[in-house]
């Protein structure tokens, strides 16, 4: 029949779970730049991988248009909190698109973890998780920002991370 | 044409959303063993199910190699907090693989919820959610651990749970 | 061959990522009704969309039976807490089905954020995220509830949201 090529391609895609775009990037020592830019991520070592998505300067870049479930977790912690820090920490996922000059807020959380030290200690820990479905065109990028990034705790890539997959 | 068998299989897979591996396991009275092992889960009753994944002693077991979005939520709570507990509660997803003798940390959160009681009441509640994409080979397992598990609050399977699906 | 129609349909479904049901609804000024009902959501403007799912009075409605990853985040915040508020805020996803008269709890979190103000200020922020896989039959609905909804902070649809996609 005349469907040979497409048929093989379809079977191949089925076998590989359709090469569905997916990525999981992990926190690393270089993640926190202090420059006011987005967090940077490990893309290859350990648990990190890219499949059908690209990475560029902290951003996951769509190679295929569609709806993606994007997610990020950041581990926050400190011994007390820096004075002058607003009582809010903001963790967000933002879209960069050539069609608009500014980053677009996609998913955002605000938390006040500094009041969470236990009576034992001024040490506190908190975690912020974000996840949701957004539409990305080819070439559009998603980045993670945390304000104040001084409170992000990195360790081994398991506590702060960033990922996506097409739905 | 010569594609009959495969064609039927492909149509069948499409109809059932490709029998995409998925699972959602729920907390139960037996979840907390106090043995230092991982949390155990309900696999059949209520909201719990397994589709294309196996379960063994607290672990989700991959039957098909690929990338999985794995997730867990635990409900934490107490009336005050035990001393001797580090001011941190750790909630994590860990991989067991025949290729390595120790569990591998996948996704981890640390929280300090004990300092959060309001005014006079010593009661506090907090929730920890983890989710991310990881690669699993056939036979590899994922488990959930919480330290200190005495602070996990079980009720009806809606507050503490563990799941996965292939992406 | 005799597979023409189905073949074209299959190719078409592959091209569109199988028209996999997905939705992301966002918080809006009208979300909080104060009526004791579920939260209401924006379905079209900004980041909000429906693809293969319907919306009705705060509910996502399944058009196709299957397993769905459902999720919701709510942004909580306040200046102190209302007296008489139990120290618990409950955020949950609930199923409505014609086969049962009452809503069924699916995924629920309890938090005590009011004690989280930092020493400088009575202002506090917290965020609650829920996500998990549940089975929905055609016509079954999922809604989001928050008790006490007075503590939900809406802004621009990025901080409180509700979504789902078939897995």
């Amino acid at each position: 029949d005349g469907h040979g090529g497409s048929w093989e391609q379809l079977i191949q895609e089925r076998r590989s779970h359709q090469n569905n775009p997916a990525a999981h990037l992990t926190g690393a020592n270089s993640s926190l730049t202090g420059s006011g830019g987005p967090l940077l991520w490990e893309t290859q070592l350990g648990l990190a991988f890219l499949r059908g998505l690209d990475y560029h300067d902290g951003a996951l870049v769509a190679n295929k248009a569609g709806y993606y479930y994007i997610y990020s977790k950041v581990q926050l912690g400190g011994v007390g909190c820096p004075l002058g820090l607003a009582s809010t920490i903001t963790h967000g996922l933002y879209k960069r698109t050539p069609r608009y000059p500014e980053e677009l807020e996609l998913l955002v959380s605000q938390q006040s973890p500094c009041g969470r030290a236990t009576s034992n200690s001024r040490v506190w820990w908190d975690s912020s998780f974000l996840g949701g479905v957004v539409h990305l065109e080819v070439g559009e990028e998603v980045v993670v920002r945390v304000l104040d990034e001084r409170l992000v705790r990195l360790r081994d890539g398991t506590r702060s991370y960033f990922g996506a997959f097409m739905v | 044409d010569g594609h009959g068998g495969s064609w039927e299989q492909l149509i069948q897979e499409r109809r059932s959303h490709q029998n995409n591996p998925a699972a959602h396991l729920t907390g139960a009275n037996s979840s907390l063993t106090g043995s230092g092992g991982p949390l155990l889960w309900e696999t059949q009753l209520g909201l719990a199910f397994l589709r294309g994944l196996d379960y063994h002693d607290g672990a989700l077991v991959a039957n098909k190699a690929g990338y999985y979005y794995i997730y867990s939520k635990v409900q934490l709570g107490g009336v005050g907090c035990p001393l001797g507990l580090a001011s941190t509660i750790t909630h994590g997803l860990y991989k067991r693989t025949p290729r390595y003798p120790e569990e591998l940390e996948l996704l981890v959160s640390q929280q300090s919820p004990c300092g959060r009681a309001t005014s006079n009441s010593r009661v506090w509640w907090d929730s920890s959610f983890l989710g991310g994409v990881v690669h699993l080979e056939v036979g590899e397992e994922v488990v959930v651990r919480v330290l200190d598990e005495r602070l996990v609050r079980l009720r009806d399977g809606t507050r503490s749970y563990f799941g996965a699906f292939m992406v | 061959d005799g597979h023409g129609g189905s073949w074209e349909q299959l190719i078409q479904e592959r091209r569109s990522h199988q028209n996999n049901p997905a939705a992301h609804l966002t918080g809006a000024n009208s979300s909080l009704t104060g009526s004791g009902g579920p939260l209401l959501w924006e379905t079209q403007l900004g980041l909000a969309f429906l693809r293969g799912l319907d919306y009705h009075d705060g509910a996502l409605v399944a058009n196709k039976a299957g397993y769905y990853y459902i999720y919701s985040k709510v942004q909580l915040g306040g200046v102190g807490c209302p007296l008489g508020l139990a120290s618990t805020i409950t955020h949950g996803l609930y199923k409505r089905t014609p086969r049962y008269p009452e809503e069924l709890e699916l995924l629920v979190s309890q938090q005590s954020p009011c004690g989280r103000a930092t020493s400088n200020s009575r202002v506090w922020w917290d965020s609650s995220f829920l996500g998990g896989v549940v089975h929905l039959e055609v016509g079954e609905e999922v809604v989001v509830r928050v008790l006490d909804e007075r503590l939900v902070r809406l802004r621009d649809g990025t901080r409180s949201y509700f979504g789902a996609f078939m897995v």
Epitope: S121 | V79, G80, C81, L83, N120, S121, R153, R155 | -
Partner: antibody, heavy 120, light 111 residues
Framework: EVKLEESGAELVKPGASVRLSCKTS????????VYWVKQRPGQGLEWIGE????????NFNEKFKSKATLTVDKSSSTAYMHLSSLTSEDSAVYYC?????????????WGQGTSVTVSS | DIVMTQSPASLAVSLGQRATISCKAS??????????MNWYQQKPGQPPKLLIY???HLDSGIPARFSASGSGTDFTLNIHPVEEEDAATYYC?????????FGSGTKLEIK
């Protein structure tokens, strides 16, 4: 064996101060809060407050905030309560107790009590 | 503050019979299915002794003739069969909210 041993009886004048001690043994001192409880002659029990032996952080019943000071000495596993500006209302037996979180913050072990008499 | 109302103030029970003491809290002392209510026994010249924790759990070494139940605001201590050595004052105490508060006590006399 878990033990809380309190210091001996005190007879003090109005306006004076007193320091009571509670020496613990048989358990890890820093793993349990120490509570202090007051019992007036022929009366019921009143919770004064607690101290976290890990860092010496106290928490008081509002009623006793200006009356009692709680401290610990980790090296000797001893808790102390200092009572100031004593009046006849402060005449009572004072108990130190161990709070067990696993038992719902119940006081599972008690000292024998220290009798304080305020009299001129 | 949570007010604990204990009754009766005193009771006399014959040897081998049942003693029942009630304690009512001014607000619920429940958390996640447990009542944060404890019961103590005090004999003259001695410190109180923990009998029951979290509404119904017997402390180690306490005889099984002691039992307790309740939830929310209403709690009960039972002793059956009463023995001579049970003559004492019994106190209930809530441990969910600061300041922790005690009932005024029930004096049990054995007839």
């Amino acid at each position: 064996e878990v033990k809380l041993e309190e210091s001996g009886a005190e007879l003090v004048k109005p306006g004076a101060s007193v320091r009571l001690s509670c020496k613990t043994s048989g358990y890890t001192f820093t793993n349990y809060y120490v509570y202090w409880v007051k019992q007036r002659p022929g009366q019921g029990l009143e919770w004064i407050g607690e101290i976290n032996p890990t860092n010496g952080d106290p928490n008081f019943n509002e009623k006793f905030k200006s009356k009692a000071t709680l401290t610990v000495d980790k090296s000797s596993s001893t808790a102390y309560m200092h009572l100031s500006s004593l009046t006849s209302e402060d005449s009572a037996v004072y108990y130190c107790t161990r709070s067990n979180w696993d038992y719902g913050n119940a006081m599972d072990f008690w000292g024998q009590g220290t009798s304080v008499t305020v009299s001129s | 503050d949570i007010v604990m109302t204990q009754s009766p103030a005193s009771l006399a029970v014959s040897l081998g019979q049942r003693a029942t003491i009630s304690c009512k809290a001014s607000q619920s002392v429940d958390f996640d299915g447990d009542g944060y209510m404890n019961w103590y026994q005090q004999k003259p010249g001695q410190p109180p002794k923990l009998l029951i924790y979290k509404a119904s759990h017997l402390d180690s070494g306490i005889p099984a003739r002691f039992s307790a139940s309740g939830s929310g605001t209403d709690f009960t201590l039972n002793i059956h069969p009463v023995e001579e050595e049970d003559a004492a004052t019994y106190y209930c105490q809530q441990s969910i909210e600061d300041p922790f508060t005690f009932g005024s006590g029930t004096k049990l006399e054995i007839k």
